[in-house]
């Protein structure tokens, strides 16, 4: 006869491991007992369980409640056992010793491999600002056994670097994603992808990029200066900019306070029916946590009674 087993049994942390040991005997041969022991190199054998043809299953105290026979029906030549709720410390070499009649004793070894699936974590880097050089966007760390694979999935252009730390029974892998921040990256997904044999599918953690910037400011509304004449209703100036975080707007008049009746509504300055009092230099001040910009315009309200139109200047400043 001969013993049938596996060289390696692989199980995920927390699952039950079936340790196979089947005696393929000649007719008339009987198995008296199957003794299981853990036999890691450099350490003495540690008894696990005994399957006895008469006495049944004995589980040694160190494994009490964790070793069972597979569910029926059972073949009397099958000495396989189930190791419940495998933990990382169970990883190692196991031996089954089969005592048969009349053929004698046989033994076989197998290696139990316990996969520890990673629980990845993603840590964003420092705040990204347009104009910075190569900057850490995010780092992703995953620890498992064996070492997990950590990669990035994104349409953003960048560079990656990885490092690994080996522990006694696992390895931690950290991958960093660096980029040169630009406003076009704002809102783009950066996804850490972790692969591991203990995972049914890759684990993905997505980070949305936020790049701080502030565009140049400009003022719209004075394109046709002939519209800015005494008595005109609904005249308005609109300040144009964009940024991340979204900017706030503030209107002032350079040559004095805002005339009465002029309404400030965020980026828009609304005028009552125009009078010559509304002529002046208006400044739009745009700001966010990243930067601030100014744009100023000169409003010259025309008197239709006068023949010659007056020039309107647009000046933008930062």
């Amino acid at each position: 006869g001969e013993l049938e087993t596996s060289d390696v049994v692989t199980v995920v942390l927390g699952q039950d491991a079936k340790l196979p040991c089947f005696y393929r005997g000649d007719s008339g041969e009987q198995v008296g007992q199957v003794a299981w022991a853990r036999v890691d190199a450099g350490e003495g054998a540690q008894e696990l369980a005994l399957l006895h043809s008469k006495y049944g299953l004995h589980v040694s105290p160190a494994y009490e409640g964790r070793v069972e026979q597979p569910p029926p029906p059972r073949n009397p030549l099958d000495g396989s056992v189930l190791l419940r709720n495998a933990v990382q410390a169970d990883e190692g070499e196991y031996e089954c010793r089969v005592s048969t009649f009349p053929a004698g004793s046989f033994q076989a070894r197998l290696r139990l491999r316990v996969l520890v699936p990673p629980l990845p974590s993603l840590n964003p880097g420092p705040a990204l600002e347009e104009g910075q050089g190569l900057t850490l966007a995010a780092s992703c760390t995953a620890e498992g056994s064996p070492a997990p694979s950590v990669t990035w999935d994104t349409e953003v252009k960048g560079t990656t670097s990885s490092r690994s730390f080996k522990h006694s029974r696992s390895a931690a892998v950290t991958s960093e994603f660096h980029l040169v921040p630009s406003r076009s990256m704002n809102g783009q997904p950066l996804t850490c992808v972790v692969s591991h044999p203990g995972l049914l599918q890759d684990q993905r953690i997505t980070h949305i990029l936020h790049v701080s910037f502030l565009a140049e400011a400009s003022v719209r509304g004075l394109e046709d200066q002939n519209l800015w004449h005494i008595g005109r209703e609904g005249a308005m100036l609109k300040c144009l900019s964009e940024g991340q975080p979204p900017p706030s707007y503030n209107w002032t008049r350079l040559d004095g306070p805002l005339p009465s009746g002029v309404r400030v509504d965020g980026d828009t300055l609304g005028f009552p029916p125009l009078t010559t009092e509304h002529s002046g230099i208006y400044v739009c001040h745009v700001s966010n946590e990243f930067s601030s910009r100014d744009s100023q315009v000169t409003v010259d309200v025309l008197d239709p009674q006068e023949d010659s139109g007056k020039q309107v200047d647009l000046v933008s400043a930062s």
């Epitope: 008894e47 006495y55 040694s60």
Partner: antibody
Framework: EVQLVESGGGLVQPGGSLRLSCAAS????????MSWVRQAPGKGLEWVSG????????HYADSVKGRFTISRDNSKNTLYLQMNSLRAEDTAVYYC???????????????????WGQGTLVTVSS | DIQMTQSPSSLSASVGDRVTITCRAS??????LAWYQQKPGKAPKLLIY???SLQSGVPSRFSGSGSGTDFTLTISSLQPEDFATYYC?????????FGQGTKVEIK
Amino acid sequence: EVQLVESGGGLVQPGGSLRLSCAASGYNFGSYDMSWVRQAPGKGLEWVSGIKTYGGNTHYADSVKGRFTISRDNSKNTLYLQMNSLRAEDTAVYYCAREYSDVVDYVSVRTPLDYWGQGTLVTVSS
Amino acid sequence: DIQMTQSPSSLSASVGDRVTITCRASQGISSYLAWYQQKPGKAPKLLIYAASSLQSGVPSRFSGSGSGTDFTLTISSLQPEDFATYYCQQHYTTPPTFGQGTKVEIK
């Protein structure tokens, strides 16, 4: 015919020592695990100590741990029980017994006691 | 330690009676159970091992059953030489432990 003969019992004062012997014959002594079991007067059976075939593995009841030592000499076919720091509650008939050899090389399990000696009385009294 | 509880602690029966003694373990012991017979002034004698296997030379009127925690020794037809004290013993763990005994007396 399997025979086990105990000797060494007797009267001893509390705190004293005794060494029990068990001479085995009629079988291959070195191939069997052995045990000592005692029975106080009018009481039930209590397992005291056991030793595996080649003496490297010994076990004791909590009540005697640290005071009693089991050993064997396979060349002399003899089992021993060294009893120190004896107490009144150790008073009993001490039996040596052979363990049934149907479990092979598995330390965690003891087996039934298929042959017993006639017993030797140990009395601890002042 | 595993506790072994026998019942009854004593019983009176007549020759020819069917006698049943039970033994309960405080935790599962598979079939790691033996039954012994002891007569006054004598050493115990192994009757049944592995819960139900008859030791060589023991009359077939003795039988054992059970596994796990509950076990039974049955004497199908009590004979005069069967009046004795009977002990169950577990050998699943060290220390092996005995039941307190059941004394079978003549009615």
